[in-house]
């Protein structure tokens, strides 16, 4: 049902869902701090623009009595319960920030007449794609899928001269929320990834994965998995690996690779790590400031959600337009706004665009090095290292099928 919004007469409220079930185990206090920091920035920006308005956030906490698994498994109804609470209290703001779980976002979107924008730090699954009033500020599964297909097809780089059309996907059910939905998208038989590949098999047991590493009859040399280096080590250990195996480790929200003193462990030599660039902006378009890698994490997405709302509020107020309209609800897409650590671009469907980075381990230095970058906004790969010091033969990525000639 329609809920009146606290969103007019110079007073604009943001409803922040503080759910017990969350995509990442981030203390709610940290999220609150991120939101409050975002509010300070927004107030300053509005004031600088000569807009004398009030912007506040209301934090809506779940009672945690029923939905207490702490992860996303029991989140489906928690979001709806919180919406009911908001409805009963007549406390809906101009915008809803949260939920982060795919299950809850999907259900809330399905079961409510959303005439207000929803901003999510998460909601990674394909089921949350193409939602007209939903904005996602962490890379959704669709973006990963498009990178993988682009990379598989690439065959004109000095270090990748074969198109690939096969893959194993390791998915054992213990993944974090982001990994769960990334791998889910790769597994789905109707997804773009599955459609573009000739062969794809999901490995669900540790032993299946371990056997493939030296199996002469394997159907692909490429294995995709999701998690950090420690997760891979627990699975692979110091087992021997055939020389033409390539493991693609998807680890988007982890900037440990960009710490200066990091040495890649030996078990990472057959691995390409896909992660997010730790920041791609030259402050003030100059090199005068030392750029330190920023954590692209959950709390930052909450903070950027507040900044996005501030950006849209400013535009609508400056144009003398009403905030409680479908036009406002549908406006949170196809734009670039000033995020906490630089410009943030949203695509036509309100999903964040980013620069993904593919890292390899140099056999010379045992350090992580950038092999290529990928811009999700234009679906384009940009090689960086034209003569990588790979572990693979001739410093080139092998064919995906052993013994097959040039494609």
């Amino acid at each position: 049902s329609q809920v009146s919004q606290n969103c007019h007469n110079g007073s604009y409220e943001i409803s922040v869902l503080m759910m017990g079930n969350s995509a990442f185990a981030e203390p709610l206090k940290n999220l609150e701090d991120a939101v409050n920091e975002g509010l300070e920035i927004v107030r300053g920006r509005l004031q600088n623009a000569g807009l004398n308005v009030t912007v506040n956030a209301t934090f809506m906490y779940s009672d945690g009595l029923i939905h207490n698994s702490g992860d996303c498994r029991s989140s489906t109804c928690e979001g709806l319960d919180l919406l009911r609470k908001i409805s009963n209290a007549q406390r809906m703001g101009c915008v809803l920030i949260g939920p982060s779980c795919t299950y809850s976002t999907f259900q809330m979107y399905l079961d409510t007449e959303l005439s207000y924008p929803m901003i999510s730090a998460g909601s990674f699954g394909l089921s949350c794609d193409y939602k007209e009033t939903l904005t996602r500020l962490m890379s959704p599964a669709r973006k990963l899928m498009y990178f993988l297909v682009n990379f598989w097809k690439t065959n004109d780089l000095p270090f990748k001269t074969y198109s690939w059309s096969t893959s194993y996907v390791y998915k054992n059910g213990t993944e974090t929320e982001d990994c769960f939905w990334y791998l889910n998208a790769l597994e789905a038989s109707v997804s773009y990834f599955s459609h573009e590949l000739g062969f794809k098999v999901v490995l669900r047991q540790d032993k299946e994965f371990q056997d493939i590493l030296m199996d002469h009859n394997r159907k692909s040399n490429v294995i995709i998995m999701c998690g950090g280096p420690e997760f891979l080590y627990k699975l692979k250990g110091d087992r021997a690996v055939a020389e033409d195996i390539v493991i693609i480790l998807v680890d988007l929200f982890n900037d440990q690779y960009f710490e200066d003193n990091v040495t890649a462990p030996d078990y990472m030599k057959n691995v390409l790590v896909l992660t997010l660039s730790p920041g791609n902006s030259l402050l003030n378009s100059s090199f005068s400031r030392n750029l330190s890698p920023t954590k692209r994490d959950f709390a930052l997405a909450y903070l950027n959600g507040i900044l996005l709302f501030g950006h849209m509020l400013k535009i609508f107020l400056e144009n003398g337009e009403n905030i409680t309209t479908p036009k406002f609800a549908h406006a949170f897409r196809n734009l670039t706004f000033e995020g906490y650590d630089g410009p943030v671009t949203l695509d036509d469907w309100g999903d964040v665009d980013s620069t993904m980075v593919l890292l390899y381990t140099s056999v010379d230095t045992k350090k992580y090095k950038v092999l290529l970058t990928y811009d999700t906004h234009v679906n384009k790969t940009y090689p960086v290292d034209m003569s990588p010091t790979f572990t693979w033969k001739n410093s080139k990525l092998p064919n995906d099928i052993t013994g097959r000639g040039p494609q």
Partner: nanobody, 123 residues
Framework: QLQLVESGGGLVQPGGSLRLSCVTS????????IGWFRQAPGKEREGVIC???????KYADSVKGRFTISRDNAKNTVYLRMDSLKPDDTAVYYC?????????????????WGQGTQVTVSS
């Protein structure tokens, strides 16, 4: 002795492309950050792109999506690929190197500079 030599500049029409090269000697690219700068007539020199020693590109907002950087350690060369060129991109382009104190950050200043190559975008 550490040296940087740029080449590849020239006259190009708006919307066109160029690839600049910076051939280095006297040091290993793995240990240095490389920056491309430009200076238009009557203007201050500005940073365009930096490639950290770990290989992470960082772009100025004005060129993001149009310019890309890559390196070939085997040839001791760093490339600046410039697409969708505009008249505003007309300048002398310099490459510069700095011994890396951080593998993933651009240095605040550069110690070694090339002599520059002229890029003119005009119809």
């Amino acid at each position: 002795q550490l040296q940087l030599v740029e080449s590849g500049g020239g006259l190009v029409q708006p919307g066109g492309s160029l690839r600049l090269s910076c051939v280095t000697s006297g040091f290993t690219l793995d240990d240095y950050a490389i920056g491309w700068f430009r200076q238009a007539p009557g203007k201050e020199r500005e940073g365009v792109i930096c490639l950290t020693s770990g290989g992470l590109p960082k772009y100025a907002d004005s060129v993001k999506g149009r310019f890309t950087i890559s390196r070939d350690n085997a040839k001791n060369t760093v490339y600046l690929r410039m697409d969708s060129l505009k008249p505003d991109d007309t300048a002398v382009y310099y490459c510069a190197a700095s011994g890396a104190t951080s593998r993933w950050n651009c240095p605040p200043q550069y110690d070694h500079w090339g002599q520059g190559t002229q890029v003119t975008v005009s119809s």
